[in-house]
């Protein structure tokens, strides 16, 4: 004989478990229905009645089958420096990503706790490793025969142009200057321009000014080349 199909709520077999999309209610001691994503348990089940589900209110969500009494609140709106890559719906939380030119410096379970601006390599330095959604740019000094005359988070060190007659030799931050005859560019592996990295989930605010120095010291830190601009925590 085929096994009987049990309808919720029902008492599980001794040592047995509830089926998929069901949960065991300790109070009723019954297997009861979970609520689908986008809903929550408005009324819990009893021995004779199943779970009553209701839709999540605005700005709240549930992403999984559940029996929570209240839907989860969506995260706060993305700041003006962020891009909303996933809107808040009844079934999913809002996701904010670091804007282009920024990376996630400190991640959290859902998204990013702290965004920071990608490092810009100064003249004489080129990008050794491009930034990614979760890592900063790594700069390196331009090796002999190469140069970078830009402040950039994407430019690598480029080879000096090869002159028939050199007017001014190149250095790490300046290309060679040739006399009027047309120069040739030495071959360099890879492109000069690296693409901007894809952003990641994030929360950040406007870059903060450089902090002041430690107590009891007479000098403060430089105003010049700004160390990393970072956002505040997004919690």
């Amino acid at each position: 004989l085929p096994a009987q199909v049990a309808f919720t709520p029902y008492a599980p077999e001794p040592g047995g478990t509830c089926r998929l999309r069901e949960y065991y209610d300790q109070t009723a001691q019954m297997c009861c229905s979970k609520c689908p994503p986008g809903q929550h348990a408005k009324v819990f089940c009893t021995k004779t009645s199943d779970t009553v589900c209701d839709s999540c209110e605005d700005s709240t969500y549930t992403q999984l089958w559940n029996w929570v009494p209240e839907c989860l609140s969506c995260g706060s709106r993305c700041s003006s420096d962020q891009v909303e890559t996933q809107a808040c719906t009844r079934e999913q939380n809002r996701i904010c990503t670091c804007r282009p030119g920024w990376y996630c410096a400190l991640s959290k379970q859902e998204g990013c706790r702290l965004c920071a601006q990608l490092r810009k390599c100064r003249p004489g330095f080129g990008v050794a490793r491009p930034g990614t959604e979760t890592s900063d740019v790594v700069c390196k000094p331009c090796a002999p025969g190469t140069f970078s005359n830009t402040t950039s988070s994407t430019d690598i060190c480029r080879p000096h142009q090869i002159c028939h007659v050199v007017a001014i030799p190149g250095n790490a931050s300046m290309d060679a200057v040739c006399t009027s005859t047309s120069p040739t560019r030495s071959m360099a592996p890879g492109a000069v321009h690296l693409p901007q990295p894809v952003s990641t989930r994030s929360q950040h605010t406007q870059p903060t000014p450089a902090p002041s120095t430690a107590p009891g010291t007479s000098f403060l830190l430089p105003v010049g080349p700004s160390p990393p601009a970072e956002g505040s925590t997004g919690d």
């Epitope: 004489g124 740019v137 790594v138 430089p222």
Partner: antibody
């Protein structure tokens, strides 16, 4: 206010090991590159090791390469220096320093108070 | 490695005098040079960066200059709080070496 507090220094025999820590506060730790710098009893300064903000890039001075390891825990706002095969020449005051933001802002802008390491039998 | 030759190693001067400390590099470092001041029993402190730029809050009597591979730190009209040891450093290729220091004592 930015603070860097070193700990873990002490007296160790040649060939021994020591682990230094640096607890940081007052700034967004995970966005800054950090270094260890030491000062010998003769007052000479020597850069020891560097780690970038994400912990991806590390550089070492030739005198400690293969013996010392720099690391960081961005969740704990802590910088570390594991020192092994210690020599008498490693005797120094060890400073935890913020910087350089290498390739962009090339300087050490904050220094801790230092922790003393003495290697002697 | 890049050698930083700092001079003089020490000097004694009076309040009000002017002093110039120099640092010569064994190869070009493209202005990637900070100067630090260290007072007795204290940690070093940033004074100048990029060879010529004063750190915020540093008095204008301090100035940095460069000429080729020679870098200089000048202090006009020395004040009592200026006495201590001064170090140059480079941030070109690793290892990032320091000069030997200049101990500035009060006469």
């Amino acid at each position: 206010e930015v603070q860097l507090q070193e700990s873990g220094g002490g007296l160790v025999q040649p060939g021994g090991s020591l682990n230094l820590s640096c607890a940081a506060s007052g700034f967004a730790f995970s966005t800054y590159d950090l270094s260890w710098v030491r000062q010998t009893p003769e007052k000479r300064l020597e850069w020891v090791a560097y780690i970038n903000n994400g912990g991806i890039s590390t550089y070492y001075s030739d005198t400690v390469k293969g013996r010392f390891t720099i690391s960081r825990d961005n969740a704990k706002n802590t910088l570390y220096l594991q020192m092994s095969s210690l020599k008498s020449e490693d005797t120094a005051m060890y400073y935890c320093v913020r910087g350089p933001f290498y390739g962009s802002a090339n300087y050490f802008d904050y220094w801790g108070q230092g922790t003393t390491v003495t290697v002697s039998s | 490695e890049i050698v930083m030759t700092q001079s003089p190693a020490s000097l004694s001067l009076s309040v009000g005098e002017t002093v110039t400390i120099t640092c010569r590099t064994s190869e070009s470092i493209y202005s990637n040079l900070p100067w630090y001041q260290q007072k007795q029993g204290k940690s070093p402190q940033l004074l100048v960066y990029d060879a010529t730029k004063l750190a915020e809050g540093v008095p204008s009597r301090f100035s940095g200059s460069e000429s080729g591979t020679q870098y200089s730190l000048k202090i006009n009209s020395l004040q009592s709080e200026d006495f201590g040891t001064y170090y140059c450093q480079h941030f070109w290729v690793t290892p990032w070496t320091f000069g030997g220091g200049t101990k500035l004592e009060i006469k």
